[in-house]
Amino acid sequence: TVPPMVNVTRSEASEGNITVTCRASGFYPWNITLSWRQDGVSLSHDTQQWGDVLPDGNGTYQTWVATRICQGEEQRFTCYMEHSGNHSTHPVPS
């Protein structure tokens, strides 16, 4: 088992909104849970966009999930990752 590296980034979207993206890379096996939470509660599927789980060329895998949130509400959101029985929570950078 190889645990993922998780990286959260933000980019400007429309006025008053930002897109936050959570990327997991370098993990094995490929099964992973990656999702955005608001106040600890998973966002509905229709408000998140997921990338495919793809091989990254090193025998490990990568994927991502993104969502759009209101600027100023970043503190309420975290990316939740679960892989091979381990989990972690990742905040949106300031």
Partner: antibody
Framework: EIQLVQSGAEVKKPGASVKVSCKPS????????IYWVRQAPGQGLEWIGY????????IYNQQFKDRATLTVDKSTSTAYLELSSLRSEDTAVYYC???????????WGQGTLVTVSS | EIVLTQSPATLSLSPGERATLSCSAS???????LHWYQQKPGQAPRLLIY???NLASGIPARFSGSGSGTDFTLTISSLEPEDFAVYYC?????????FGQGTKVEIK
């Protein structure tokens, strides 16, 4: 089975502080937020705040920001609510709850009655 | 702050009757963020319905939820003796998280 077990009832004098504990079991402690809610006698439910045990992030209801302190002890998988400068209006049952996959409060502790009286 | 107003405050009904409880929000709420809880005397609340219309685990099918925007409804199709309790709506869309003041369903 998921359970949240809270500490016992407390009687405090006005101006004192109280610390209530909440020990969840049946799931990974750091995977879900712990919320705190209170209910005055015969009244409704009032959200105090929550803490993310994994990263330690705390969000307070502004109404409680100056007097409530939320903490966790990851070594014992226990969450705490401390409320300072108690007054009679703080007499209430204090509940801890766990954030769920789809809602804010999916499992609840049994409640801790805090009575503030001179 | 989003204020949730529940009506009626008290509902007096007999077992077997249909109960309709309303929850009105002061601002529009996404249906993903409106939840219902049941509380019996001396007990903690328990999750009944999440995201407006989804039954929580172990909740019987006589309970249902609906609504959108600012108006939401909890319906109990045929009251059982164990359904007499206080019901709260709660919104998780904006901070602070808020609850309605509750509707007490009592035996007539």
């Amino acid at each position: 089975e998921i359970q949240l077990v809270q500490s016992g009832a407390e009687v405090k004098k006005p101006g004192a502080s109280v610390k209530v504990s909440c020990k969840p079991s049946g799931y990974a402690f750091t995977s879900n937020n712990i919320y705190w809610v209170r209910q005055a006698p015969g009244q409704g439910l009032e959200w105090i705040g929550y803490i993310d045990p994994y990263i330690g992030r705390i969000i307070y209801n502004q109404q409680f920001k100056d007097r409530a302190t939320l903490t966790v002890d990851k070594s014992t998988s226990t969450a705490y609510l401390e409320l300072s400068s108690l007054r009679s209006e703080d007499t209430a049952v204090y509940y801890c709850s766990r954030s769920g996959e789809r809602s804010n409060f999916d499992y609840w502790g049994q409640g801790t009655l805090v009575t503030v009286s001179s | 702050e989003i204020v949730l107003t529940q009506s009626p405050a008290t509902l007096s009904l007999s077992p077997g009757e249909r109960a309709t409880l309303s929850c009105s929000a002061s601002s529009s709420i996404s249906s993903n963020y409106l939840h219902w809880y049941q509380q019996k005397p001396g007990q903690a609340p328990r999750l009944l319905i999440y995201r407006t219309s989804n039954l929580a685990s172990g909740i019987p099918a006589r309970f249902s939820g609906s609504g959108s925007g600012t108006d939401f409804t909890l319906t109990i199709s045929s009251l059982e003796p164990e359904d007499f309790a206080v019901y709260y709506c709660q919104q998780g869309g904006s901070l602070p998280l808020t609850f309605g003041q509750g509707t007490k369903v009592e035996i007539k």
